[in-house]
């Protein structure tokens, strides 16, 4: 049900060749109240004007009501993400009503036709909600529409057409093609519900972006930058290249939004946090780990309602599978001086040592370049909770690993053959935990030894809580 190229065939066919046979009946929309976690349980079909199924199936008028809305399909059968989501909602909200919106007849079409059907389906959902509102105790504020891919825009239409305002819409990687840049009334937008939160997991700035790139909610969360999801590379997905196609990678990344949401339901004790940032590059630099003024939020079901004047783009890193939570750290390294740097950027690694665990060796990604006599900010993240940080090992990698760096080194050597050793001086590392917001300062173990060069390491121990040092003016302003 998800993608404009799903896992069931060749890419080039997908936008043009319908898999559905010509339907013999006028297509319609069904509302299946899932009354059990058991995927084989039939559930109950609800229809406007018929109150008996509501009674027969114990529809709880005062409880939360979730409507799950699938997307485009090439198979005419529900994919497994849907039953995972139904089951997770039942586990988390035992008294809630979980309704699956079955619009397969209108979704099992050419992609362009399915897009054109989204408005009709939105109307159907709005009619169902308007009818339910006539019942005593039913509140639109308790309604949460969860739409995946094309279903996210269906949810937007439903929220737009209903009499009143639905409590919440969650868009799970809303579809991109034919919606990117569209007018707000023709796509999911913040005015479709009291709170609209969105997860973007398959956005691409080149080629066809299956998921929408633009922010469309009150908060728009871009896990791993919203594009390359860990565990979804060709090698990860296929296991053996013989058994799969690129479409499985597409499915993996697009569907990741659903699994992140499911994770937030079932792993409540391991919430993932996202941080407001203007763009992915700034986040990768580590300058966006602030929680001041609502700048951070839980992702998925546990997201706190935020109604910003303008869209809030938020970022986080994740693991490759459930539970997806990682621990983010901002590292500020002030480089006091360096010698003979040449053209090549150094390759640094850090190992963090904590009261609970030690991290693996983590690369410091240099987004632009190392600045001297300036504070350089980096983002690192760990899969395990390290506890309180005690010390840090900083390593400057010796031999270059990339051919490009080798070539630059060779060129540098030709122009300056007697190049004395490269070296830079670091006295302190400031660390801020994204999850706890705690700030720590680490000083070199030996105050006399602050220099590091290729193939060498430098050790830092915690020297104080907080960042401000005595008689020191902060060299940089903390950025949002």
């Amino acid at each position: 049900s998800p993608v404009p190229f799903g896992p069931e065939g060749r890419l080039e066919d997908k936008l043009h060749k319908p898999k559905a046979t010509q339907t013999e009946v006028k297509p319609s929309v069904r509302f299946n109240l899932r009354t059990s976690k058991d995927p084989e349980h039939e559930g109950c079909y609800l229809s406007v004007g018929h109150s008996q199924p509501l009674e027969d199936c114990s529809f709880n008028m005062t409880a939360k009501t979730f409507f799950i809305i699938h997307g485009w399909t090439m198979s005419g059968i529900f994919e497994n993400w849907l039953h995972k989501l139904v089951s997770a909602l039942h586990t988390r909200e035992k008294d809630a009503n979980v309704v699956v919106v079955d619009w397969l007849p209108l979704a099992h079409q050419l992609y362009t036709d399915a897009v054109n059907n989204t408005r009709v389906v939105g109307h159907s959902i709005a009619r169902m909600l308007d009818w339910l509102q006539e019942k005593d105790d039913f509140s639109l504020g308790n309604v949460h529409l969860i739409g995946y891919s094309l279903g996210a825009h269906v949810a937007g239409y439903a929220g737009n057409f209903v009499k009143g305002t639905v409590g919440r819409i969650t868009g799970l990687d809303p579809a991109g093609p034919m919606f990117e840049g569209a007018d707000i009334h023709k796509r999911l937008s913040p005015d479709d519900a009291d709170f609209v939160d969105v997860l973007h997991t398959y956005t691409r700035s080149f080629g066809l972006s299956i998921g929408i790139q633009m922010p469309v909610g009150h908060i728009d969360i871009y896990p791993n930058g919203g594009d390359f999801q860990p565990g979804c590379g060709l090698n990860d997905v296929l296991g053996s290249i013989a058994y799969g196609t690129i479409t499985e990678v597409v499915k993996c990344e697009h569907e990741r939004a659903v699994h992140l949401f499911v994770d937030s339901l079932v792993n409540q004790d391991k919430p993932s946090f996202a941080f407001q940032c203007t763009d992915s590059n700034r986040f990768k630099k580590g300058i966006c780990l602030s929680c001041r003024k609502n700048r951070c939020n839980s992702i998925g079901y546990n997201a706190k309602k935020m109604r910003n004047k303008r869209n809030s783009k938020m970022y986080l890193k994740t693991r490759a599978g459930m539970p997806f939570r990682v621990y983010h750290y901002q590292m500020k390294i002030h480089v006091f001086s360096y010698k003979n740097m040449g053209e090549i950027e150094p390759t640094f690694y850090v190992t963090l040592y904590g009261t609970n665990a030690d991290s693996q060796t983590l690369p410091l990604e240099i987004v632009e370049r190392i600045e001297q006599n300036a504070t350089n900010t980096f983002l690192v993240y760990t899969e395990e909770d390290l506890g309180d940080l005690l010390k840090i090992q900083l390593t400057w990698e010796g031999a270059s690993q990339s051919w490009y760096n080798l070539w630059k080194e060779f060129r540098s050597y030709l122009s300056q053959p007697r190049n004395p050793g490269r070296e830079l001086n670091i006295r302190r590392i400031r660390v801020k935990s994204g999850e706890t917001q705690r700030k720590l300062t680490f000083c070199t173990e030996d105050p006399e030894n602050t220099s590091i060069s290729p193939g060498r390491e430098l050790w830092f121990r915690k020297c104080r809580d907080g960042w401000r040092m005595k008689n020191e003016t902060s060299p940089t302003v903390e950025l949002p």
Epitope: G76, N80, P105
Partner: antibody, heavy 120, light 107 residues
Framework: QVQLVQSGAEVKKPGASVKVSCKAS????????IHWVRQAPGQGLEWMGH????????NNNEKFKDRVTMTRDTSISTAYMELSRLRSDDTAVYYC?????????????WGQGTTVTVSS | DIQMTQSPSSLSASVGDRVTITCRAS??????LNWYQQKPGKAPKLLIS???KLHSGVPSRFSGSGSGTDFTLTISSLQPEDFATYYC?????????FGQGTKLEIK
């Protein structure tokens, strides 16, 4: 109780077509999908495709490409599978099977099978 | 397509024996594995769905386990009516695929 009753055995010549029927009873026909699985003599099971009786949407195994056509008649709760351009290696027992609404749902009830023999 | 490989292809056992049949998928199938029993001249019958869920009416001597790519069907104490061919099937990805079968014969 749930029952799937299939049409009788068929003998066909290469190049011909065969149409097998599967009548469902004991449940709401449009609430589950109907799948077709075949088994060549002494061989394993091979999924051919399915139909969603609710609206008639189908999906076929690429192996059968355009040779298989699945239809249904909701008024008599019956699904049909037509296989065209028959070859001798299409000789097999053809089963219809009921499956729930998800990919993961098992084939929980099966028809008794229809033997199709392709021979010149 | 996901390849399903069963082992052994055939096995001989006696009434009362404990028997284990394994099924390996060529990639992770998220525990979406079903087991069927087929007797000569009959249609397959569902035994176990979702790796370990016993279908209604199936005796409790049948059990399923596993995760990721490796799964097993266990019959704790073979009965005369259990001699048949057993198939595993993945429900993770289209096209749905079956193992080649394991024929369980009387020793």
């Amino acid at each position: 109780q749930v029952q799937l009753v299939q049409s009788g055995a068929e003998v066909k010549k290469p190049g011909a077509s065969v149409k097998v029927s599967c009548k469902a009873s004991g449940y709401t026909f449009t609430d589950n999908t109907i799948h077709w699985v075949r088994q060549a003599p002494g061989q394993g099971l091979e999924w051919m495709g399915h139909i969603n009786p609710y609206y008639g949407g189908t999906n076929n195994n690429e192996k059968f490409k355009d040779r298989v056509t699945m239809t249904r008649d909701t008024s008599i709760s019956t699904a049909y599978m037509e296989l065209s351009r028959l070859r001798s290696d299409d000789t097999a027992v053809y089963y219809c099977a009921r499956k729930g609404i998800y990919y993961s749902s098992p084939f929980d009830y099966w028809g008794q099978g229809t033997t199709v023999t392709v021979s010149s | 397509d996901i390849q399903m490989t069963q082992s052994p292809s055939s096995l001989s056992a006696s009434v009362g024996d404990r028997v284990t049949i394994t099924c390996r998928a060529s990639q992770d199938i998220n525990n979406y594995l079903n087991w069927y029993q087929q007797k000569p001249g009959k249609a397959p019958k569902l035994l176990i769905s979702y790796t370990s869920k016993l279908h209604s009416g199936v005796p409790s001597r049948f059990s399923g386990s596993g995760s990721g790519t490796d799964f097993t069907l266990t019959i704790s104490s073979l009965q005369p009516e259990d001699f048949a061919t057993y198939y595993c099937q993945q429900g993770n990805t289209l096209p749905f695929t079956f193992g080649q079968g394991t024929k369980l014969e009387i020793k």
